[in-house]
């Protein structure tokens, strides 16, 4: 009652291995790591045979087959390359996730590099099976901004991306009647926030209360240059409308907002995140030089009061911007504090200017981001949001413009993003 | 048409409370303000409030507060206004309208004795 | 809250007659945002309610006729009817909506 001699798979073995097998005698098929005993097209670790009565074996051999890890998981805003020949997804291959750069960024500047195991499932190092995170680059624009530049009102053009944070806010207040209709700017966060001040996202027709307006009336316009033509941008409805809780109609204090996008944007050489300042309470050193962009007011030539009343188009056509020294605190204080008028410039803004005027942000434009070259990440940030200024002309003598300082606000924005303040860090303190 | 179908006049006594009522036809309801409005010989016109009847947002002139409490039912396009301790200063004429353009029928309310 | 004064509290004049009444408000009503003056007249006929004519103190409502007309910027406003017929024997309101709105004390309108 003797059974035939075995003959072990190719990458596998039998156990116990033995001269001569007998009735009742049973082996154990199993195959090397990395290989799984195939039998009958079913997968399984091992497989036991059994020596019969009449001397033959209860099952034949199986055979082993390579662990096959098959098509890598997508991943979002990135790409995968293949490192065996012929895009091999078996055991021991390896791929190389990347992230469509130079729009993102691989999170924790994991290498992204995956082996397929002999478990069959794609693994990381650090990762293990969870596939990386491509998070939006911030505050590098496709063009590179040149140092000249002179003032919105009357200024200079803004060639498509340099500003691929800078959205167009439309706001149409259908609640009342007859509508109301608005714009003012705002600042790409992510793929899907909007940074801007809270007073363009503010019901108009009341002017004591802070009532926000209906998500509804709100569309954000991304990667605009010319709003005649609005055939390249991306139109996007809001989710949320997020007004600061202590936003102060009065004096404008916490004038800062965000607007959650129905969808994630595309990103692109004209659509790509401003980044976040460190939650820094002094804000902007005094005299540095930011950048503020927008479709405000830039006749030069019209007081603001004939450009309200008349009933002209007032946007201009084509983004304008302006580079503006950042005014000490004390000195902009006593500006204000010297005109008649109830202003007051708190802690939570900073102002930028010149004190010979002739260049300055305007009607229009609030909401917008004064950026600062951040030279330790190499990246542009958010450092203010155009908020107010006044009475006189804007870019009249020794009338500074007003800015949310948005370092004060660091981790409320984190808050209603949802996202850890730790995840998205690295982007500006590398 | 916009069209604002106000209830019928109301005699009240000192220190009893009223709701009047207000409805819409003609346009969606729930996405416009309706205000309210008091009429009084002598005394001109005078805005009570408002208020927004999709998401019951109001907003109150601060001499009416805790006179006036407004309400909306969308299922029935309609909206409230309760006047509460009635004095006879409060015997007027009530308009509600259509954010700024179309005004109700209005409802007279008296408070005598 | 922002006053708002009319006048003359009333006037009389004869059919065919241009007339002209001012509203004035305690401060402007000029939203430099939306770039409206939110101030509106009503015309408010005898035992009816009012009708809203102009809004953001120069467009003219539809339906209303363009003998009427409304201008001014900032805290001074006025309603012109340029031919006056039998018809526009009225009250003539203005109301002020940049803040918790207010109405002016009207100005009432006879016909000779």
């Known amino acids: 009652n003797e059974c035939p001699e075995l003959q072990p798979p190719v990458h596998g073995k039998i156990e116990p291995s033995q001269a001569k097998y007998f009735f009742k005698d049973q082996v154990l098929v199993s195959c090397d790591t990395g290989y799984k005993v195939l039998k009958d097209n079913v997968e399984m670790d091992t497989f036991q045979i059994e020596c019969l009565k009449d001397g033959t074996w209860s099952n034949k051999i199986p055979t082993c087959k390579i662990v096959d890890c098959r098509a890598p998981g997508e991943l979002e805003h990135g790409l995968i390359t293949f490192s065996t020949r012929n895009n091999l997804t078996t055991y021991k291959s390896e791929i190389k996730y990347s992230c469509q750069e130079p729009y993102y960024k691989m999170l924790n500047n994991n290498t992204g590099i995956y082996t397929c195991s002999a478990q069959g499932v794609w693994m990381n190092k650090v990762l293990g099976r969870s596939l990386p995170t491509c998070l939006p680059e911030c505050g590098q624009p496709s063009r590179s901004l040149p140092s000249l530049v002179k003032r919105i009102i009357g200024g200079r053009n803004a060639e498509p991306g340099l500003f691929p944070w800078q959205a167009l806010i439309v706001v149409e207040d259908t609640s009342r009647v007859p509508n109301d209709k608005w714009f003012g700017s705002g600042a790409l966060l992510s793929a899907s926030w909007i940074l801007t001040a809270a007073h363009v996202l503010r019901s108009q027709r009341r002017d004591t209360t802070v009532i926000p307006v209906s998500k509804e009336h709100v569309t954000v316009y991304l990667g605009l240059h010319d709003v005649r033509d609005k055939s390249g941008a991306v139109n996007s409805s809001a989710a949320r409308v997020v007004l600061h809780p202590d936003f102060n109609i009065q004096n404008y204090n916490h004038d800062i907002a965000l607007v959650q996008l129905q969808e994630p944007v595309p990103l692109g050489p004209h659509v790509m995140p401003v980044c976040l300042p460190r939650l820094e309470p002094e804000g902007p050193a005094p005299h540095m030089l930011g950048l503020v962009a927008g479709w405000g007011i830039s006749n030069p030539n019209v007081t603001v009061d004939e450009i309200i009343s008349s009933g002209t188009r007032t946007l201009s056509d084509v983004l304008q911007y302006v580079k503006l020294p950042v005014v000490p605190h004390a000195e902009c204080k006593t500006s204000y504090e010297s005109r008649s008028g109830n202003y007051s410039v708190t802690e939570n803004m900073f102002c930028a200017g010149y004190y010979e005027g002739g260049k300055d942000t305007c009607l229009g434009d609030s909401g917008g981001a004064f950026v600062i070259f951040d030279d330790l990440s190499q990246r542009w940030v958010v450092q203010g949001l155009v908020s107010w200024g006044g009475p006189e002309e804007c870019g009249s003598k020794q009338v500074y413009g007003v800015y949310t300082k948005v370092s004060n606000y660091v981790d409320w924005v984190w808050e209603q993003m949802g996202l850890p303040q730790s995840v998205v860090e690295p982007q500006v303190e590398r | 048409q916009v069209q604002l179908k106000q209830s019928g006049a109301e005699l009240m006594k000192p220190g009893a409370s009223v709701k009047l009522s207000c409805k819409a036809t003609g346009y969606t309801f729930t996405g416009k303000w309706i205000e309210w409005v008091k009429q009084r010989p002598g005394h001109g016109l005078e805005w009570i409030g408002e208020?927004?009847?999709?998401?019951?947002?109001?907003n109150y002139n601060e001499k009416f507060k805790g006179k006036a409490t407004f309400t909306a039912d969308s299922s029935s396009n309609t909206a409230y206004m309760q006047l509460s301790s009635l004095t006879t200063e409060d015997s007027a004429m009530y308009y509600c309208?259509?954010?700024?353009?179309?005004w109700g029928t209005g409802t007279t309310v008296t408070v005598s004795s | 809250d922002i006053v708002m004064t009319q006048s003359p509290s009333s006037l009389a004049v004869s059919a065919g007659e241009k007339v002209t009444m001012s509203c004035k408000s305690s401060?402007?009503?000029?939203?430099?945002?939306?770039?409206?003056?939110?101030l509106a007249w009503y015309q408010q006929k005898p035992g009816q309610s009012p009708k809203l004519l102009i809004y953001?103190?120069?467009t003219r409502e539809s339906g209303v006729p363009d003998r009427f007309t409304g201008s001014g910027s900032g805290t001074d406003f006025t309603l012109t009817i340029s031919s006056v017929q039998a018809e526009d024997l009225a009250v003539y309101y203005c109301?002020?909506?940049?803040?918790?709105?207010?109405f002016g004390g009207g100005t009432k309108l006879e016909i000779k």
């Open positions: 401060q402007s009503l000029l939203n430099s945002r939306t770039r409206k003056n939110y």
């Open positions: 953001w103190a120069s």
């Open positions: 208020i927004l009847p999709g998401t019951g947002s109001t």
């Open positions: 109301k002020q909506s940049y803040n918790i709105p207010t």
């Open positions: 309208l259509r954010s700024e353009d179309v």
